[in-house]
């Protein structure tokens, strides 16, 4: 079962490669240091 998060990357979990496709519809701050939205 693929598990999707907001990072583009892989994580080894129980020897399974899981792809974290970037969710472009989300402004969660997956990119380190990229200003997202306004001040909240």
């Amino acid at each position: 079962d693929a598990e999707f998060g907001h990072d583009s990357g892989f994580e080894v979990r129980h020897q399974k490669l899981v792809f974290f496709a970037e969710d472009v519809g989300s402004n969660k701050g997956a990119i380190i240091g990229l200003m997202v939205g306004g001040v909240v």
Epitope: G9, G29, I31, I32, G33, V40
Partner: antibody
Framework: EVQLQQSGAELVEPGASVKLSCTGS????????VHWLKQLTEQGLEWIGR????????IYTPKFQDKATLTVDTSSNTAYLQLSSLTSEDAAVYYC?????WGQGTTLTVSS | DIVMTQSAFSNPVTLGTSASISCRSS???????????LYWYLQKPGQPPQLLIY???NLASGVPDRFTSSGSGTDFTLKISRVEAEDVGVYYC????????FGGGTKLEIK
């Protein structure tokens, strides 16, 4: 002023644990992922992992899976990085980052 | 792990001229979705790093357009036109195709 304020420098004995904090001011830490990075020298950055404060979901670099624990206390608007079983290799500057905001860094010294 | 390789020092540059900093990845950072997951950060002396470029060619907010990035899937170049004194620092490339890894950093030297 919007900022992430990190806790002060730490001097810790080998084998012990330490919990570093990162507090948002003028900024709701719950909204965006909090990333943590390790800088061994001025030239060298490692990504430890990140936490989604909304649900506590974490992702770690495999190297730090057994070393680091990321948590968030939304009531105090604070993210934490706990490091266990400290050795001299853990001595570094640690940064938290959320959205476009960086903490000033916390220097960890491991020495007996 | 994807390994990001940079030379430790740039060729010394004269203020007002252009500088280029290179970076190589051990695996193509071009995803099938068309995005190249390559980033550039600058760490000025005594400060945390700051994001300059994201996903190979996008300028982060507040970054002057003197900074441009180009490359293929594995070889990348950050070009700084009209170098200013405030550009001095260590430049890191990074990838997040597979989690995040950073290059060792390239120190920009002024003549």
């Amino acid at each position: 002023e919007v900022q992430l304020q990190q806790s002060g420098a730490e001097l810790v004995e080998p084998g012990a644990s330490v919990k570093l904090s990162c507090t948002g001011s003028g900024f709701n830490i719950k909204v965006y992922y909090v990333h943590w990075l390790k800088q061994l020298t001025e030239q060298g950055l490692e990504w430890i992992g990140r936490i989604d404060p909304e649900n506590g979901e974490t992702i770690y670099t495999p190297k730090f899976q057994d070393k680091a624990t990321l948590t968030v206390d939304t009531s105090s608007n604070t993210a934490y990085l706990q490091l266990s079983s400290l050795t001299s290799e853990d001595a570094a500057v640690y940064y938290c980052v959320s959205s476009g905001y960086w903490g000033q860094g916390t220097t960890l010294t491991v020495s007996s | 792990d994807i390994v990001m390789t940079q030379s430790a020092f740039s060729n010394p540059v004269t203020l007002g001229t252009s500088a280029s900093i290179s970076c190589r990845s051990s695996k193509s950072l071009l995803h099938r979705n068309g995005i190249t997951y390559l980033y550039w950060y600058l760490q000025k002396p005594g400060q945390p790093p700051q994001l300059l470029i994201y996903q190979m060619s996008n300028l982060a907010s507040g970054v002057p357009d003197r900074f441009t990035s180009s490359g293929s899937g594995t070889d990348f170049t950050l070009k700084i036109s009209r170098v200013e004194a405030e550009d001095v620092g260590v430049y890191y490339c990074a990838q997040n195709l597979e989690l995040w890894t950073f290059g060792g950093g390239t120190k920009l030297e002024i003549k």
